[in-house]
């Protein structure tokens, strides 16, 4: 669709005569008829296939024609067409004399024709005017013409309809060739697809307007490249949505069970060595001079009774000093000047000569120790109680007082709440410090797996095209993570193909 525009500029008829040579009375009141038609090698009469237009009387004899386009007038003359411009044309311009006010062809005598010109040729669509002048023996006509496209039509032959728009069916303006030019932030064949925030994850993010990044279920972050871990995951991470992969030292379904109490809580004091011995369980190995479950108690260096053979211990700033009884010497009174003849063995110990009588050794009865059997045995010195148990001397024997959750002679056994198989429907039992926890199989929940729930939403393999299925345990629904090139809640539809017409 376009318009052939003809701008009449000047008509010269100095003698004021008709084509027959007869003069006009009183002068030639001149108007024009224009016929636009398809290209003819020899322009002949016949239908004006591209259109016709007539002017009112524009002047008498010779006159210049005013450009009236700005005032809504008729110059340039408009010959609209509703077809593809063929690039060639034929044009007939007739100048007529109007004796009266009726300009209809049937109201005029045939000899009212002043002049007739006919041209033909090629004409491309464009803004530039082509200037032409046609001269006959008595008249001269100067004019220019061009073809331009109608509003919203584009291209070399005005055949491409394009209307700029900025709504949800497109965000574009039209290029000179009629192709769409997307507004900033939009893309796609019809510029209806927003360009998401730069870096927004191709599969896990999307947008409904430019520079936006909305996350699909299971993803978060400014660019939707961070997975959302399982609801309730405490000390864990994920690489795909709804996972809970435990950090080092943590365990359990929600990574909330402390498997590394030593590192996380540093319970041992005074430089003691900490050893993990189970969930929330540990043992402290104290440095010399300290005692207690957490080695929090400072010992006097004399508390370990370092002086032998009845020597008395004196604490000093830099250690201790043994005061030896008569007949003994050495740092710990360990050397004797006595022999068996001096009856050095106490508490019924029997004496044995050594080194040809120069020395001796006492063999002590049960419950006594020391080089002279002078010490009652403290069965707790070897710290035999595990898992923080407290050692108690009980006459000839010893016993361990265990912390909650432990039993056995040396508190070496973990009290198992799981022994009675409390988890129903094949649930797995986990001992905790203050009780137990059941990990339930798919389809069951509750503290003891006693509640039947819906089965794993991914069990039926609902995702297509090799998509990864994630079960959202909080809602018992599934989420499909589509591979590149597929969309849809089940990844069932390929993207990038042009939509097909329904007919």
């Amino acid at each position: 669709s376009g318009v052939f525009q003809l701008q009449l500029q000047e008509f010269i008829n100095e003698r004021g005569v008709l084509a027959s040579g007869r003069p006009c009375e009183p002068g030639c009141r001149t108007f024009f008829r224009v016929c636009l038609k398809h290209f003819q090698a020899v322009v002949s009469p016949g239908p004006c296939t591209f259109g016709t237009v007539s002017t009112p009387v524009l002047g008498t004899n010779s006159f210049a024609v005013r450009d009236d386009s700005s005032g809504g007038g008729r110059n340039p003359l408009q010959l609209p067409f509703n077809f593809t411009w063929p690039g060639t044309f034929s044009l007939i311009i007739e100048a007529w004399h109007a004796p009266g006010d009726d300009l209809r062809p049937e109201a005029l005598p045939p000899d009212a024709l002043i002049s007739k010109i006919a041209i033909q040729g090629s004409l491309a669509v464009g803004q530039n005017w082509l200037l032409d002048e046609q001269t006959s023996t008595l008249t001269r006509l100067r004019y220019s013409y061009r073809v331009i496209c109608s509003d919203n039509y584009y291209g070399d032959n005005c055949s491409r309809l394009c209307k700029k728009r900025n709504d949800h069916f497109g965000h574009y303006v039209c290029q000179p060739d009629g192709n769409l030019s997307c507004l900033p932030g939009w893309t796609g064949e019809y510029c209806q697809q927003p360009i998401c925030l730069s870096g927004c994850h191709e599969q896990n993010g999307y947008c409904s307007k430019p520079a936006e990044c909305l996350c699909r279920p299971g993803w978060q972050g400014r660019l939707c490249n961070e997975c959302i871990p399982h609801n309730g995951c405490r000390h864990g991470t994920c690489s795909t949505p709804w996972q809970c992969t435990c950090d080092e030292g943590w365990g359990g379904l929600f990574c909330d069970q402390d498997l590394n109490y030593c590192t996380h809580h540093s319970p041992c004091k005074n430089g003691a060595t900490c050893s993990n011995s189970g969930q929330r369980s540990y043992t402290c190995t104290c440095r010399p001079g300290y005692t207690g479950v957490d080695c929090e108690l400072e010992l006097s260096e004399c508390d370990s009774n370092p002086c032998r053979n009845g020597g008395s211990c004196k604490d000093q700033e830099d250690g201790y000093h043994c005061l030896c009884p008569p007949g003994y010497y050495g740092l710990h009174c360990e050397h004797s000047t006595l022999s068996c003849a001096d009856s050095p063995c106490f508490n019924g110990g029997s004496c044995r000569e050594r080194n040809q009588g120069a020395n001796y050794a006492c063999e002590c009865p049960p419950n006594f120790t020391g080089s002279n059997c002078e010490k009652k045995v403290d069965r707790c010195t070897s710290n035999p109680c595990a898992n923080g148990g407290q050692c108690l001397n009980r006459g000839p024997s010893r016993m361990c007082r265990c912390r909650p959750g432990f039993t056995g002679t040396y508190c070496e056994l973990h009290v198992s709440d799981c022994a009675r198989n409390p988890c129903a429907h094949g649930g797995t039992c986990h001992d905790l410090e203050n009780g137990l926890m059941c990990t339930c199989p798919a389809g069951f929940s509750g503290r003891r797996c006693e509640v039947r729930t819906s089965i794993d939403a991914c069990a039926s393999s609902p995702c297509f095209n090799r998509a990864t299925c994630y079960t959202d345990l909080s809602t018992d629904t599934f989420v499909c993570n589509c591979p590149y090139g597929f969309v849809g809640s089940r990844c069932e539809f390929p993207v990038g193909l042009p939509p097909s017409f329904p007919w």
Epitope: Y190, Q192, G488, P499
Partner: antibody
Framework: EVQLQESGPGLVKPSETLSLTCTVS??????????WGWIRQPPGKGLEWIGD???????YYNPSLKSRVTISVDTSKNQFSLKLSSVTAADTAVYYC?????????????WGQGTLVTVSS | SYELTQPPSVSVSPGQTASITCSGQ??????ASWYQQKPGQSPVLVIY???KRPSGIPERFSGSNSGDTATLTISGTQPMDEADYYC?????????FGYGTKVTVL
């Protein structure tokens, strides 16, 4: 061949909420090339566009109804829904769902058969 | 709000041409669609993008749109063309329908 089918109650009491669902078969609602619209027609009157939605949930509403309208989409069920709150007798109409095609410059090439909703106590 | 105005009714003899107009401010700068609706039936798209026909729509239906007016023309009208006709355009993000024209084939 794409087909659309409206469903929902045919009678709603004044001041209550009108709820309708459109089920799409023979094609996917999850395409960037389409919007899914609701249009209504009071008895003996002309067509009135209510609003539309795409598969991502972007919605557009008629300004004259915007305060009362909610349109949502469920791609897993290939459905989209209309809720119109605080209804009056003036909301009595045949309600149509339709597919609006980007290629057709927003023209609606497929329509449901329509469902008459009467607002009356 | 944007309005599209149509004549309430148009009468035409069989075999003649019926022209239905649709007027709106600068409508020529928007894409016009036309729908045919017969009693008790859903609307059917007969023209989109001003002048294009969906497949299955007879060639006697044609459309044009310029200035403030879009026109649906039915050449060689047949009795089966008797129906209500609605024009439609988009004003920003809102769909707008004309008031409808009843075409009667005499």
């Amino acid at each position: 061949e794409v087909q659309l089918q409206e469903s929902g109650p045919g009678l709603v009491k004044p001041s209550e909420t009108l709820s309708l669902t459109c089920t799409v078969s023979g094609g996917s609602i999850s395409s960037s090339g389409y919007y899914w619209g609701w249009i209504r027609q009071p008895p003996g009157k002309g067509l009135e566009w209510i609003g539309d939605i795409n598969y991502r949930g972007s919605t557009y509403y008629n300004p004259s109804l915007k305060s009362r309208v909610t349109i949502s989409v469920d791609t897993s069920k290939n459905q989209f829904s209309l809720k119109l709150s605080s209804v009056t007798a003036a909301d009595t109409a045949v309600y149509y769902c339709a597919r609006e095609d980007v290629i057709l410059r927003g023209g609606s090439d497929y329509w449901g058969q329509g469902t008459l909703v009467t607002v009356s106590s | 709000s944007y309005e599209l105005t149509q004549p309430p009714s148009v009468s035409v003899s069989p075999g003649q041409t019926a022209s239905i107009t649709c007027s709106g401010q600068r409508l020529g700068d928007k894409y016009a669609s036309w729908y045919q609706q017969k009693p008790g039936q859903s609307p059917v798209l007969v023209i989109y993008e001003d002048s294009k026909r969906p497949s299955g729509i007879p060639e006697r239906f044609s459309g044009s749109n310029s200035g403030d007016t879009a026109t649906l023309t039915i050449s060689g009208t047949q009795p089966m063309d008797e129906a209500d006709y609605y024009c439609q355009a988009w004003d920003r993000d809102t769909g707008v329908f004309g008031y409808g024209t009843k075409v009667t084939v005499l």
